[in-house]
Interface confidence: low
């Protein structure tokens, strides 16, 4: 499977909410011995590999924001911890998963990464990620609502397999 990032750039005004999205593409094994682990984190554009560095989102680590579930299930992060930080990550039955950030500030600007680990019990993992940029703007040049820029066809399969 692959991870697609439908949008590579989100430009939002301060105070707005935004939902960053990734999507699982390709054959996804839904057997009973397969579990998916999904999470979000901030990163920087490394020379060798984007998303190799994992930094917290609003002081929540990728461990705090993770989702784990079998192939047939939907999942949400634990509401209390994440919502206190204005965050919620979620996943549906169709391979979409997202993180919603509320009341954006300039400090939220940066590179965001989604990570998916397919765990086959008694076997090794398959790990892929996607990356997208969030720009939070203030002042007269800021848009009134979030503006999203679709990924190019090349970027939309923004994938690094382990």
């Amino acid at each position: 499977f692959k991870v697609a990032t439908p949008y590579s750039l989100y430009v939002c005004p301060e105070g707005q909410n935004v939902t960053l999205t990734c999507r699982l593409l390709g054959p996804v094994d839904k057997g009973h011995d397969v579990t998916f682990y999904k999470t979000w984190y901030r990163s920087s554009r490394g020379e060798v590999q984007t998303c190799s560095e994992r930094r917290p989102i609003r002081n929540l680590t990728f461990q705090d924001l993770h989702l784990h579930h079998g192939g047939h299930q939907a999942a949400n992060t634990s509401h209390d911890l994440a919502q206190r930080h204005g965050l919620e990550s979620a996943s549906d039955h169709h391979g979409n998963f997202s993180i919603t950030m509320r009341n954006l500030t300039l400090l939220d600007s940066g590179l965001y990464c989604c990570l998916v680990v397919e765990i086959r019990h008694h076997h090794s993992e398959h790990r892929v990620h996607g990356a997208m940029e969030l720009q939070v703007q203030t002042g007269k040049d800021a848009p009134s609502n979030c503006v999203v820029y679709p990924s190019s066809s090349q970027d939309s399969e923004n994938i690094t397999a382990a």
Epitope: Q49, H68, H121
Partner: antibody, heavy 120, light 107 residues
Framework: QVQLVQSGAEVKKPGSSVKVSCKAS????????ISWVRQAPGQGLEWMGG????????NYAQKFQGRVTITADESTSTAYMELSSLRSEDTAVYYC?????????????WGQGTLVTVSS | DIQMTQSPSSLSASVGDRVTITCRAS??????LNWYQQKPGKAPKLLIY???SLQSGVPSRFSGSGSGTDFTLTISSLQPEDFATYYC?????????FGQGTKVEIK
């Protein structure tokens, strides 16, 4: 602060079994993989296998398959490693180590180690 | 299994020296490589993950680089507390394998 505290040193006879425990505190237990890594005297590190408590299924190195059993008790946040049919070359320090997320293999927290001595 | 080969197996250096340890994988592991420091009688400590990312709390004099099969750990200015054994570890596939270690000793 995450801590992994292991059970005490053991002296065992060849052919017997040993069960080492690793109790986690200070963090979520269930969704992190716990691996077991051993180190024979003066030697390097050797991965034996691991488990994600919430999934319950362990993953073992082929070398130890059939001789090692890794389990976890979510209610006590404790992982266990049992090694059977012990031989003298199993004399080593056994470490539990927590992976930094899910079924990943970078070990960010380690137990203090448990020395298992196999001697007749 | 993926074999990990470290060199040198030991080295002598002085405080302030720049030290480089290399690790080679028997097949490509992308950037799925971690570095650990171990002192006698202690558990290993994670220094670098994903080949080049510094683990939280680790001094910036430690750095990692490489991808594919060839990797390097560099200590830019050796400090007294850095005398220890260093291990690389591939995280690409099971069984997880470690290099044989590099012992950094005082010259």
């Amino acid at each position: 602060q995450v801590q992994l505290v292991q059970s005490g040193a053991e002296v065992k006879k060849p052919g017997s079994s040993v069960k080492v425990s690793c109790k986690a505190s200070g963090g979520t237990f269930s969704s992190y993989a716990i691996s077991w890594v051993r180190q024979a005297p003066g030697q390097g590190l050797e991965w034996m296998g691991g488990i994600i408590p919430i999934f319950g299924t362990a993953n073992y190195a082929q070398k130890f398959q059939g001789r090692v059993t890794i389990t976890a008790d979510e209610s006590t946040s404790t992982a266990y490693m049992e090694l059977s049919s012990l031989r003298s070359e199993d004399t080593a320090v056994y470490y539990c180590a927590r992976s930094s997320y899910g079924w990943s293999y970078e070990f960010d927290y380690w137990g203090q180690g448990t020395l298992v001595t196999v001697s007749s | 299994d993926i074999q990990m080969t470290q060199s040198p197996s030991s080295l002598s250096a002085s405080v302030g020296d720049r030290v480089t340890i290399t690790c080679r994988a028997s097949q490509s592991i992308n950037t799925n490589l971690n570095w650990y420091q171990q002192k006698p009688g202690k558990a290993p400590k994670l220094l670098i993950y994903a080949a080049s990312s510094l683990q939280s709390g680790v001094p910036s004099r430690f750095s990692g680089s490489g991808s594919g099969t060839d990797f390097t750990l560099t200590i830019s200015s050796l400090q007294p507390e850095d005398f220890a054994t260093y291990y690389c570890q591939q995280a690409r596939d099971t069984p997880i394998t470690f290099g044989q270690g590099t012992k950094v000793e005082i010259k």
